[in-house]
Each structure stands twice: as C-alpha cells, then as structure tokens.
C-alpha cells in the first residue's frame, strides 16, 4: 500500500462481551416430536469475542439416562462431554478448549457455553439426549464471524482504494458512483480474508466517492473527496 | 396405541381413603413419567404430581403432598394414587397423563376416575 | 410458583370466524430457548386433548386452523376458522419446571 495516502479512514467494531443465545426459537422447530429419534440441525453465525450458549432439546432431567455433546472442531480430534444421571458424574473426552464449558452442573442446565468465541470454535456442536425410548439430538454448525477492518484511501490520481481486511466471511465492496474497479480477495491461514477494491473515475464533476462494504456482522460506509487532478478544468455541475 | 386405562367412579366417606389405579399399555411402562392432575366439577386443571416408573422419582405439589400417595407396578404397568382423610373438597375427577419427552407435554391422558367424598 | 392467567374466561364466536384465547405468564415461562406453554381442548365428559405444544407447534393429528403464538409472558391461541365441534373449554399449561400449573380455562361457544 502506498505511503502518500491522502486520506485514511478507519472502522474497526469494538466489541464488548455480548452474549448470543444459540438456543433454537421454539418458531424454528419443522419437525414433528411426538416420536424418538427426532434430529435438526441449524447453521448459527456468531460474531468472534461474544459468549454463545448452546442448548439441547426441551427434555427433562427426569426424563433422561445420558447428555452428551459432541464437540468437532477442525483439525482437532472429537470432543465429548458427558453427564450420566443416574451416578451424578460428568465426563470429558479429548476437550481441551477451556472456554467451551457447560453452563452451569448438568443436573440443573444441560446448555454449553463458549465464552468469547474465536475463530478456533468454528465447528458443529451436538447434544444428545438418551432417554429410555430413545435419543434426541440438536446440532449446530457453528460460523465465527469476524467484522473487518474498514479503510479508504487515495493513492493516486482520482483512483480510490477501499480495503475490507481480515473478515469472516469475506466483505462485499460496492461504490458509489460506480467507477472502474478492480477486486483482489486474499486468504489468511486462520480463515479470514481480506477483500481489497480498487477504483478510477476519469469523470472528473465526481468529487466525492463511497466504499460501502457489505458483511454479516454489519454494514459500513466510508466515504473520501477525490483530490483533483492538477491543471484539470473542472467541468460545471 | 398408547391406551391409559382407569379405574371405575368411587363413592366414599369423609375421613376414609380411596386408591385408584392407571393401567397403560401399548408402550414401554418405565420408560415415561406418569403425572396425576384433578379436575373439580365445573372447575379448571390442577397438578397433583408425579411418578417415574423406572426409578420410582417421584415429585408432588406442595399443596397435594400430605393427601396423594403416588406407587407404581412394574409388573402390571399400572400407577396408583391414594388419596388420603378425604373431605367434600376432595371429589373431582382424577386423571392420569403420560409426560412426552419433548417439551413436558401430555399427549395421551386416562380416560379420569370420579371421586365423590359424601357421608 | 408461575401463575397462568387466562382471558377471556368466556366468549361466543360465529361459525367459520377466528376466536383468540389469551394466557398470561406470571413470570417468562422460557428456559434454553424454549417456551414451555402449552395449549388443550376439554370437552364435557372427557380429558383434556393437546393441541399446541412449547407455545406454537401443532400436535399431530389437530387440525390446522388451531395455531399459537406468543413468547416470554404473553402467548395466543387462535383458532380460525371455528367450527361447531370446537365449542370447548381451553386451557394453557406450564411445564418448565415444578409445579406445573394450568391457566383458569376459557369456554369457547359457537354462535
């Protein structure tokens, strides 16, 4: 990037520890409950650095053997947490993400908690519920959304530069007027992407131009005055 | 078919006691939790308690904790309720309801045993 | 203890019009996302039927003009259109956690 920036504007979210509850809306439920062996699964995004619960179907202690959730993370080996009523005893397998906890004893809340979610946790959580007659499951596939990095610059005559960086998923760049653009995508190893869009107006009454970067954690909008070319007449509005 | 079968009407004495019973077929007995609810003549629903035949849990309401007495038969799939020192408040409807797993619900309900407490 | 307050206590609705039951919650009646409320059917004589089960699910085999709405501490039971087989008395439930408790019922007649 070039060091005669002549105008930077930045936006980067401040994120405070919100809590997102991935506990399925009773609306959502498609499925008919009256028989065991009953399953859904929901995709969930949630943005990086909040605290997420996850719950497990609407079963009741007194109705249950075993809650397992199973933990699959990539590149990790599967992660269970399991509680067996009857001896009162929790038991964990392969977890080693400190963060990723039950809420409170299983015997009183059967939910999972991540407290401030990384990009780690992106994976798919299930609960199981054994019962006598059967096993009920709730799945989710976790996406950790990451807000990017927002900054618009100019670089060089009447051309633009509008940078969405490090994002997950990747940012959408749109500009208004439209001009002559060009976009490059770049991946990181830790499954952000950086979206950068380049743009020239040759029309020179357009003085003032907008980034408008379009993500899942929100939406923003820069906008710069285009410096204009020296010795160029400016054509009347 | 689930089927929930109750005993027939009782007509019985203040003071004394009444047991009645709930005979479910058409599924696995310990397998689900047995609820008893009571209906007054004219009135609404109230909760009474319930038994889980697979380890015999059982839980009242507060109210109902000195009057039922909750049991259960493993071997004739069938919950009893006795209801004890009987008064004129005590002649309702009594009915039994099996608890679904999803959502606590009761899907399938006894057809109810009338209680009438009269000297 | 959540106490369901239900309202009206009565109402006359026309054949083939929509009739609206509410209940009340004395407390939200939501635990891990879920609205334990419940809504049955009682006519004389015979024991409450399951209608709704957690605030808006149709039971199997209830016809779909019974629907259920609500969250938190207010929830909705509408039925439209009404038929003549559906003058009954209404109950909302609670079963989230002990005591369960039921609301006071609605009688619904057609007129």
């Known amino acids: 990037q070039p060091n005669n920036s002549l105008m930077l504007q930045t936006s980067k979210e401040n994120h405070a520890l919100a809590s997102s509850s991935l506990c399925m809306d009773e609306k959502q439920i498609t499925q008919n409950y009256s028989k065991v062996l009953a399953e859904v699964n929901t995709s969930w995004p949630v943005k990086m650095a909040t605290n997420a619960v996850l719950c497990c179907p609407p079963i009741a202690l007194r109705n249950l053997i075993i809650i397992t959730w199973e933990i699959i993370l990539r590149g990790q080996p599967s992660c269970t947490k399991a509680y067996k009523k009857e001896t009162n005893e929790t038991k964990e397998t392969n977890c080693t993400d400190e963060r990723i906890t039950w809420v409170s004893r299983p015997d009183q809340n059967s939910d999972l908690q991540i407290r401030t979610v990384a990009i780690t946790h992106d994976g798919y959580y299930r609960c199981i519920m054994v019962t006598p007659d059967g096993n009920f499951h709730r799945g989710y596939h976790l996406q950790v959304l990451v807000t990017p990095e927002v900054t618009l610059f100019q670089n060089r005559n009447r051309t633009a530069v509008c940078k969405a960086v490090a994002g997950k998923p990747a940012a959408h760049i749109s500009w208004i007027p439209e001009g002559d653009c060009a976009t490059k995508q770049e991946y990181w190893s830790n499954g952000t992407v950086t979206v950068k869009s380049t743009c020239h107006w040759e029309v020179h009454n357009v003085s003032t131009v907008t980034c408008h970067v379009s993500h899942l954690t929100g939406n923003k909008s820069l906008y710069i005055e285009l410096l204009p070319v020296p010795g160029a007449k400016k054509s009347a509005k | 078919e689930v089927q929930l079968q109750q005993s027939g009407p009782e007509l019985v004495k203040p003071g004394a006691s009444v047991k009645m019973s709930c005979k479910a077929s058409g599924y696995t007995f310990t397998s689900y939790v047995m609820h008893w609810v009571k209906q007054k003549p004219g009135q609404g629903l109230e909760w009474i308690g319930y038994i889980h035949p697979y380890n015999d849990d059982i839980k009242h309401n507060e109210k109902f904790k000195d009057k039922a007495t909750l049991t259960s038969a493993k071997s004739s799939s069938t919950v009893y309720m006795e209801l004890s020192s009987l008064t004129s408040e005590d002649s309702a409807v009594y009915y039994c309801?099996?608890?679904?797993?999803?959502?606590?619900?009761?899907?399938?309900w006894g057809q109810g045993t009338l209680v009438t407490v009269s000297a | 203890d959540i106490v369901l307050t239900q309202s009206p206590a009565s109402l006359a609705v026309s054949l083939g019009q929509r009739a609206t039951i509410s209940c009340r919650a004395s407390?939200?009646?939501?635990?891990?996302?879920?609205?334990?409320l419940h809504w049955y059917q009682q006519k004389p004589g015979q024991p409450p039927k399951l209608l709704i089960y957690l605030a808006s699910n149709l039971e199997s085999g209830v016809p779909a003009r019974f629907s259920g709405s609500g969250s938190g501490t207010d929830f909705t039971l509408n039925i439209h259109p009404v038929e003549e087989e559906d003058a009954a008395t209404y109950y909302c439930q609670y079963s989230g956690e002990l005591p369960f408790t039921f609301g006071g019922g609605t009688k619904l007649e057609i007129k």
């Open positions: 309801a099996r608890e679904e797993y999803y959502g606590s619900r009761f899907a399938y």
């Open positions: 407390k939200s009646v939501r635990t891990s996302g879920y609205s334990y």
